[in-house]
Every structure is written in C-alpha cells, then in structure tokens.
Amino acid sequence: MKVLQEPTCVSDYMSISTCEWKMNGPTNCSTELRLLYQLVFLLSEAHTCIPENNGGAGCVCHLLMDDVVSADNYTLDLWAGQQLLWKGSFKPSEHVKPRAPGNLTVHTNVSDTLLLTWSNPYPPDNYLYNHLTYAVNIWSENDPADFRIYNVTYLEPSLRIAASTLKSGISYRARVRAWAQCYNTTWSEWSPSTKWHNSYREPFEQHHHHHHHHHHH
C-alpha cells in the first residue's frame, strides 16, 4: 500500500481542516488508514482522524482543531496499521479556504431595487470575520448566457442592484462565496442558491411615453 498523491490540506480557520490524498489502488480508507495530527510542541496526545473514501483510491479526512492561531503548525502522520506511509506538516493559516456564507436572501419588496443579504460564516471574534469579501453570482434559469458576477469588496454582507438590470418576468437564482485577501485564501464553496421571480415593471410614465411614441410612428 502506497500513497500516490500526497495529502493536501485546507483550513476553515476556525475548527476544521480537510485533507485529501490518493492511494495507489482501491482502498477502504476508514478501516485501513489513520491520519494522526498534532500541533507542534503540544504535550497532549496526537489526535486521530478516521478518513472517508473519496472515490476508489481517494481519501478525505476532516481534522477537528481548536480555533486557529496564525503561527499554528501541525505534524501529520498517515498510518496503515503499524506502517507509516507518509509524514508531513501543515500550517493552517497558509492554506485557508473560508467557510461558505449562509442564509442568502433576496428582498424584492422595494419595486425597483433588489437587496441580497447573507450571513458572514464566522463569529465576530474570529480574525476572518472582518476580512471577508464576497462574489455574488446571479443567473437566469431560462437563459444560460444571462450569467453575472458582482464583486462585493466592502465588509457588509449585502448587495443592492437595480431590478431593471435583470430581465423582467423570469426566474433568477443567486449564490455567494467568500475569500480573504489577508491570508491569500482560496474561494469558499458557493452558498446554497436561492431563487426568485424578477417581476420588475417599468414605471407608468415610461410605459405611457413609450406607447405614445410608438403611436406616432
């Protein structure tokens, strides 16, 4: 039994780090392998992660950690019974993948404006709480070409857009993801998408003017 693709890990900079690797053949990860991880200098016992299968030869492990400190460095040991297959280290602050934002809501009660709000996935005492920026993806269910990304570079987890920038009378979906420049993180996964019907109507004056103009011709 050998490791074909060495473990690579990402941290949510809160309580979970996820490590993935590939073996050289089909493996029952949970029964055959163990990933031991320990904070460097920690005097208490190393923690054990039981991996799950991630495809035939792939394994994934979710390492439970205490809240992360920027200098944290972990040793990682991948064992198959009494055989050490791989030894490495992992610094969570250098491999951050933020948690996905949640509770994405589209407020359509203001006729000419769409307000999208979502929740910051971190508690206020986490360093990333005040360092996340977001990308909001809006797309039409009817037209695959109607696909747009809005970058939200301010801290407030919300986005206002004019309803008129979207087509009227059709359904749209939105989703949001996050990243933090301070730790040069990867993007988070997308949040679950939310759907709404864009029923924007042009103001009466515009309709009236338009019809009058049309009549002229």
Partner: antibody, heavy 119, light 108 residues
C-alpha cells in the same frame, strides 16, 4: 469529574530529596500532557517541569534542571516529581496540572502539596 | 526566555465596575496566551486560552483580547466572587513557558 491529588510534600533538610506524586482520575490520563507548577509563599506561579502524554519528552527551567525529574506511570494514572539536592528556595506549594487537549494551557489543577526545605 | 509583565500589579474596584488587566510579553507570542484566576489558598482556575477563548464554565463577563505582545483581560461587570490574583501565561514555542507576576484584584 477530573481530579488531581498531590501527595508527598513535607519538611526536608537542604540537600535532601523528596518524591511528589499526583494521582489522576476522571479522564484518560495517558492522552494528556502534565506539569508541575510551584508557588513560593506570597509569590507567583513558576512552571518547574513538563512531560508529554507518553512520557517521551520532558522539560525543565534552568533553576531545577539536573535536580528535578518528572515522570509518569500511565498504567497507574500517576505523575511524579523526584526532587534532589533541595534548597531553601525550593520551598513552595507544588501543584500538579493537566495540559488542555488542544493547547499548552493548564485546564485542571490539583490542590497542591507544600514542600518546606529548612534545617 | 520570554519575559512577562502585568499591569497594574494590584487594583481595587467596586462590584459592577469594569476592570481591565494588561499583560505584555518581551516578544511576539501571537495568540498563545492563557489567563488564570487564583484565590487565597486555592489552586489557579483556567479562564481563557488563545488570548480570547473562554474556557468551559467561565462566565461571559470575562473576556480576553490582544495578540503579538500586548493582551488584556476584561471583566465587564465585577462580581464579589471575582476577587483574587490574575495571572497570564504564554505557551509559545518549546516548553519554557512562563507566567506573568500576577495582578491582585481587591473588591472595594
């Protein structure tokens, strides 16, 4: 309930020896790092010895290095501190403490045992 | 070894008052800092670790902040049972960890 109970303290003459014990219960002793911390009368806390969960790694400050030895018997759930060549300045309450599971902060402490070094 | 200082060395405060104790270190310890409370004749009690995370069972009136070389312990609304000596302790790097000299908090 986590409990740490120290014993073995007492009056000893300068140059003498003493062995402190700490009986642990209420947790899986063999998975935790442990330490001895002392406090001289009216003074602050001083870490005098640490040992990792399997006993393979120990550490001491210069003030006790070569004189004190920390050890553990995981089968007996007991931590020890062997103190040799004792000096007057070693007089203190000696606490046994457990290191937190994820960090090297001490989350549980015993009630302490008093060691008095005097002629 | 990393040197630890605490200020003030002692203070007297009234019930309900907000109290702040500062701990400084001679070099960057990131957030590897714990706080303990000790009452006369008793062992220390674990309050805070990672500079800001409350230990289990610690009332929410206690909070910690800071990173690098300067840290604070705050008690937002002092209770009579909060008197005692407060110690900070760093646990950065290999096990040569030191405690601060302590801050004695007396209730007025």
């Amino acid at each position: 309930e986590v409990q740490l109970v120290e014993s073995g303290g007492g009056l000893v003459q300068p140059g003498g020896s003493l062995r402190l014990s700490c009986a642990a219960s209420g947790f899986t002793f063999s998975t935790y790092g442990m330490s001895w911390v002392r406090q001289a009368p009216g003074k602050g806390l001083v870490l005098v010895a640490t040992i990792n969960s399997n006993g393979g790694s120990t550490s001491y400050p210069d003030s006790v290095k070569g004189r004190f030895t920390i050890s553990r018997d995981n089968a007996k759930n007991t931590l020890y501190l062997q103190m040799n060549s004792l000096r007057a300045e070693d007089t203190a309450v000696y606490y046994c403490a457990r290191f937190f599971r994820f960090r090297n902060a001490m989350d549980y402490w015993g009630q302490g045992t008093l060691v008095t070094v005097s002629s | 070894d990393i040197q630890m200082t605490q200020s003030p060395s002692s203070l007297s405060a009234s019930v309900g008052q907000r109290v702040t104790i500062t701990c400084r270190t001679s070099e960057n310890i990131y957030s590897y800092l714990a706080w303990y409370q000790q009452k006369q004749g008793k062992p220390p009690r674990f309050l805070i670790y990672n500079a800001k995370t409350l230990a289990e069972g610690v009332p929410s009136r206690f909070s910690g902040s800071g990173s690098g070389t300067e840290f604070t312990l705050t008690i937002t609304s002092l209770q009579a049972e909060d008197f005692g000596v407060y110690y900070c302790q760093h646990y950065y790097g290999p096990p040569t960890w030191t405690f601060g000299p302590g801050t004695k908090l007396e209730i007025k």
